[in-house]
Interface confidence: medium
């Protein structure tokens, strides 16, 4: 699936962390799945969710840790370059994507307090940006031993190599399909109305479609909610306001890759939903 062909590291550093919270943390993503987490308090890169079971080479997580400790040092150095002002939040999006021809397309961009301000230019082999903050940080980073070369190596070699490894070794994780468990419930709303809520639990991949039918005819998609679960799966719900007494005319249709065909979800009886 196309969405799996990327490996992205989301890096965040804060200049003034709250006591007991990390100054730097990273989440690593293979397509829509988080496979890695790192923070400056633990100082170790660790696998997430089903990636704990991936059959990786023994030194794999040590290498991830080494690379992220280098990134941590760079990110925290950046705040020194900016002086005592602040507070600052520095974010990075680093990684690579495999194109249709199996070539790797790197990405490296940085945001300061939520605004993109700097990138790493592969052709020029340096960090670029015209904000004074970008200039201060890039000069600081250029002074670090072989930092630009390490960034190039990370983007052009380490990242695509890791991505291809995961595509091989972790294929089971990437092809994981978990169908949703479903519920359709009604609850009273404003006088004369009820709210129907169609809920989908513990599904993967995250792409899912919920819609309502009234007597077999399209009745809209309702107001939706969507989010991740701690185990890597997702949950979603959609709500529709209907006339009281009319609830039993409605059903919910769910479409998902884990289902052979669209599933029709009927309204639960009041007894069951209590």
């Amino acid at each position: 699936a196309e969405s799996h062909l990327s490996l992205l590291y989301h890096l965040t550093a804060v200049s003034s962390p709250a006591p007991g919270t990390p100054a730097f943390w990273v989440s690593g993503w293979l397509g829509p799945q988080q496979y890695l987490s790192y923070n400056s308090l633990r100082g170790e890169a660790e696998p997430c969710g089903a990636w704990v079971w991936e059959n990786q080479v023994s030194w794999y997580w040590e290498k991830e840790t080494t690379d992220l400790r280098i990134k941590e040092k760079l990110f925290l150095e950046a705040f020194k370059a900016l002086g005592g002002k602040g507070p600052y939040t520095l974010q990075g999006l680093l990684g690579c994507e495999l194109g249709p021809d199996n070539t790797s397309v790197p990405t490296a961009k940085f945001a300061l307090n939520g605004e993109e301000f700097m990138n790493f230019d592969l052709k020029q082999g340096t960090w670029g940006g015209d904000w004074p903050e970008a200039l201060a940080i890039s000069q600081r980073w250029q002074q670090q031993d072989k930092a630009a070369n390490k960034e190039l190596t990370f983007l052009l070699f380490s990242c695509p190599h890791r991505l291809r490894e995961h595509l091989e070794r972790g294929r089971g994780n990437l092809e994981w399909k978990e169908p949703p468990s479903m519920r359709l419930k009604a609850r009273p709303s404003s006088p004369g109305f009820s709210v129907l809520t169609c809920s989908a639990f513990s599904f993967y991949p995250p792409e899912l479609q919920l819609r309502f039918l009234r007597n077999g005819l399209a009745a809209g998609t309702g107001q939706g909610d969507f989010g991740p679960n701690s185990d890597g799966s997702f949950h979603a719900s959609s709500s529709l306001t209907v006339k009281s007494g009319d609830e039993h005319h409605y059903c919910c249709i769910v479409q998902h890759a884990g289902l052979a065909q669209p599933l029709r979800v009927e309204l639960e009886s009041p007894a069951k939903s209590s």
Epitope: E115, E116, Q124, T126, G128, P132, L135, Q142
Partner: antibody, heavy 118, light 106 residues
Framework: QIQLLQSGAELARPGASVKMSCKAS????????MHWVKQRPGQGLEWIGY????????NYNQKFKDKATLTADKSSSTAYMQLSSLTSEGSAVYYC???????????WGQGTSVTVSS | ENVLTQSPAILSASPGEKVTMTCSAS?????MYWYQQKPGSSPRLLIY???NLASGVPVRFSGSGSGTSYSLTISRMEAEDAATYYC?????????FGGGTKLEIK
């Protein structure tokens, strides 16, 4: 005091190239990026791109990617812009401007006028 | 690219009059920057970070706005304010300027 002194007016034939300079003084040249801006007669301002004199990093407006080349000489605190394959569209005043401490173009050169005519 | 549209293109005001010009961005920006240019001169920085006055700029100038809508106001027009005013954004590449508002004295 801070000054950006640009080279004199240029008259060029269509298809020719010109290289203009912008000499900085009164501040640390490598600590600020240098931007270049185009202004055609009676028209508005157009951002061409910038150079980081410290690293040589350049970023161009795609519109000028094949037209302008930005360079900098740290030893003389001078930024340069070369314009190639000039056409009548290239007739304009070109300004260099320093990007200051507040994400602004706080100091500007006096401009270099380029006239393209056969 | 983020297109900045300034209005009006030309504005005429009498000395002492309040003047307001606007700058509308095609995409949201964090801050807006304003420059003043008089005929035969280079542009001069007027306002940075939407509302902060650059060094030496008279307090009759003020800036405001957020998102896609920004404005520059002169509380009491003076003859020396006759110039063209440009807005500029630094939130995305390419950096772009508005087309300018030419302020004339009546």
């Amino acid at each position: 005091q801070i000054q950006l002194l640009q080279s004199g007016a240029e008259l060029a034939r269509p298809g020719a190239s010109v290289k203009m300079s912008c000499k900085a003084s009164g501040y640390t040249f490598t600590s600020y990026t240098m931007h270049w801006v185009k202004q055609r007669p009676g028209q508005g301002l157009e951002w061409i791109g910038y150079i980081n004199p410290s690293s040589g990093y350049t970023n161009y407006n795609q519109k000028f990617k094949d037209k302008a080349t930005l360079t900098a000489d740290k030893s003389s605190s001078t930024a340069y812009m070369q314009l190639s394959s000039l056409t009548s569209e290239g007739s304009a005043v070109y300004y260099c401007a320093r990007s200051g401490l507040r994400r602004v173009l706080d100091y500007w050169g006096q401009g270099t006028s380029v006239t393209v005519s056969s | 690219e983020n297109v900045l549209t300034q209005s009006p293109a030309i504005l005429s005001a009498s000395p002492g009059e309040k003047v307001t010009m606007t700058c509308s961005a095609s995409s949201s920006v964090s801050y807006m920057y304003w420059y003043q240019q008089k005929p035969g001169s280079s542009p001069r920085l007027l306002i940075y970070d939407t509302s902060n006055l650059a060094s030496g700029v008279p307090v009759r100038f003020s800036g405001s706005g957020s998102g896609t809508s920004y404005s520059l106001t002169i509380s009491r027009m003076e003859a020396e304010d006759a110039a063209t005013y440009y807005c500029q954004q630094w939130s995305s590449y390419p950096r772009t300027f508005g087309g300018g508002t030419k302020l004339e004295i009546k």
